[in-house]
């Protein structure tokens, strides 16, 4: 398994990840956002809510 060198993002990227932690993937020359639970998107900009629907009467 190839090792990936990571570090924190520079201050230059402050605000890049809207709802998550910014990680600098050194060998890949890119920033990556590790999103908080409930958020998705390249920059953790989308909120998604998983709604559990109650069972319908027909099913019961």
């Amino acid at each position: 398994v190839a090792q990936v060198s990571i570090t924190k993002c520079s201050s230059d990227m402050n605000g890049y990840c809207l709802h998550g932690q910014c990680i600098y993937l050194v060998d890949m020359s890119q920033n990556y956002c590790r999103c908080e639970v409930g958020y998705t998107g390249v920059r953790c900009e989308h909120f998604f809510l998983t709604v559990h629907q109650p069972l319908s009467k027909e099913y019961v």
Partner: antibody, heavy 116, light 106 residues
């Protein structure tokens, strides 16, 4: 493949404004920051500022503050740099540069000539 | 604003020579420095980022080192195709380029 295609060369008179466009393809500019860099003939590289296309937030070098406006249109995946009150010293190649998802991916450059 | 002082502004060396360029930051930039090569009429080409990480396809004769405020870019054995101007760029806090170093063959 990812590309940043800039608008063509411009010739402007002193005191006028210029607006350079930078159209992205192969990626969404909302996933990136778009920086602008310029280079006068025979001179070094000079960072001007940047925009976060996701929210429109901008940062400018104090030297250009008040004279430069960087904008982005996410519907067309295009960023713009407008420089006003042009003077001869603004004659330069202007580059847009993508950063964020990939470290510093450059456009081909746009030559702006300021001459009376 | 962070200032980047690059030296020398120009140098002349023979093919096969070891060439060293330095950049000094006005404050700690936490290794967030990149090095570019620019040939006349071309856009800059990224060689190294995060002090020492060589980009794909860049020859191993190019290297970088440093920490804190002091950084070095080295060409271990100068080749004719290395004739260009080299720039450092700090990206720790916004961005600032060094003044550039023009490398010529003796």
């Amino acid at each position: 493949q990812d590309q940043l295609v800039q608008s063509g060369a411009e010739v402007k008179k002193p005191g006028a404004s210029v607006k350079v466009s930078c159209k992205a393809s192969g990626f969404n500019i909302k996933d990136t920051y778009i920086q602008w860099v310029r280079q006068a003939p025979g001179q070094g590289l000079e960072w001007m500022g940047r925009i976060d296309p996701l929210n429109g937030n901008t940062k400018y070098v104090p030297k250009f503050q008040g004279r430069v406006t960087i904008t982005a249109d996410t519907s067309t995946n295009t960023a713009y740099m407008e420089l006003s009150s042009l003077r001869s010293e603004d004659t330069a190649v202007y580059y847009c540069v993508r950063s964020g998802t990939l470290f510093d991916f450059w456009g081909q450059g746009t030559l702006v000539t300021v001459s009376s | 604003d962070i200032q980047m002082t690059q030296s020398p502004s120009s140098l002349s060396a023979s093919v096969g020579d070891r060439v060293t360029i330095t950049c000094k930051a006005s404050q700690d930039i936490h290794k967030y420095i990149a090095w570019y090569q620019q040939k006349p009429g071309q856009a800059p080409r990224l060689l190294i980022q995060y002090t020492s990480t060589l980009q794909e396809g860049v020859p191993s004769r190019f290297s970088g080192s440093g920490s804190g405020t002091d950084y070095t870019f080295t060409i271990s054995s100068l080749q004719p195709e290395d004739i260009a101007t080299y720039y450092c760029l700090q990206y720790d806090n916004l961005r600032t380029f060094g003044g550039g170093t023009k490398v010529e063959i003796k």
